[in-house]
Amino acid sequence: HSDGIFTDSYSRYRKQMAVKKYLAAVLGKRYKQRVKNK
């Protein structure tokens, strides 16, 4: 079983955290925009 076949669990964790961070930033931005437009 070659290491290259898999993305290891830490790499997957880091990607998940990056996605979470990105979504939080995008959603936060949208929320601020909505409040501003009211």
């Epitope: 079983h1 290491d3 898999f6 290891d8 669990s9 830490y10 790499s11 997957r12 964790y13 880091r14 955290m17 961070k21």
Partner: antibody
């Protein structure tokens, strides 16, 4: 390198905070774990902190008994209410950079003795 | 939490001989397992990670194999300096297993 400090003799129920200090490395890039070893016993995993985002996770038995936190240069382990069973040498270790490649960098450990 | 079971608890090996230590995980951890050597009064030393990759500076007489739930550490051509306690550790972290990285109970290697 990493170095643990703060171990001493405490009476049961007295909170104690241990500190893991990193020299020459940026802690924010690594996963850090705390492990303990009672005299003559094996290694017991306590928990870890992702020093980048501050997320913490604990072994089931350790939840509520320990708190892991970080500053820019240290990772701390608080023993919330020590009992005599918490007498052990406490180690911190650094992932490389995460956990999947094992933990290559260990401190020498700090001894905690809980006794009345 | 994942449980790591190591066998035997103690093993004796002759200088130049071969010693084999087994580690079993309670669920699949793919190839994310490491092995450590610990001598009295010292912290653990990483020997092998990803089940079979030798850590930096570790002699080639140490080798690891396995995948899923069954793993083996082999010391070929045992030397006196190899007398120590050896531990396996789960390094497979997921939300489902709460990112917990337990150790096996340890195997003491006595060199004759």
């Amino acid at each position: 390198s990493v170095e643990e400090s703060g171990g001493r003799l405490v009476t049961p129920g007295t909170p104690l905070t241990l500190t893991c200090t990193a020299s020459g490395i940026d802690l924010s890039s690594y996963a850090m774990i705390w492990v303990r070893q009672a005299p003559g016993e094996g290694l017991e995993y306590i928990g870890f902190i992702d020093a980048g985002d501050g997320n913490t996770y604990y072994a089931s038995w350790a939840k509520g008994r320990f708190t892991i936190s970080k500053t820019s240069t240290t990772v701390d382990l608080k023993i919330t209410s020590p009992t005599t069973e918490d007498t052990a040498t406490y180690f911190c270790a650094r992932g490389d950079p995460g956990w999947s490649n094992g933990f290559a960098l260990w401190g020498q450990g700090t001894l905690v003795t809980v006794s009345s | 939490d994942i449980v790591m079971t190591q066998t035997p608890a103690s093993v004796s090996g002759a200088v130049g001989g071969t010693v084999t230590i087994k580690c079993q995980a309670s669920q699949s951890i793919r190839n994310e397992l490491s092995w450590y050597q610990q001598k009295p009064g010292q912290p653990p030393k990483l020997l092998i990670y990803k089940a079979s990759t030798l850590a930096s500076g570790v002699p080639s007489r140490f080798s690891g194999s396995g995948f899923g739930t069954e793993f083996t550490l082999t010391i070929s051509g045992v030397q006196c300096d190899d007398a120590a306690t050896y531990y396996c550790q789960n390094n497979y972290g997921t939300r489902r297993n709460n990112y917990v990285f337990p150790f096996g109970g340890g195997t003491e290697v006595v060199v004759k």
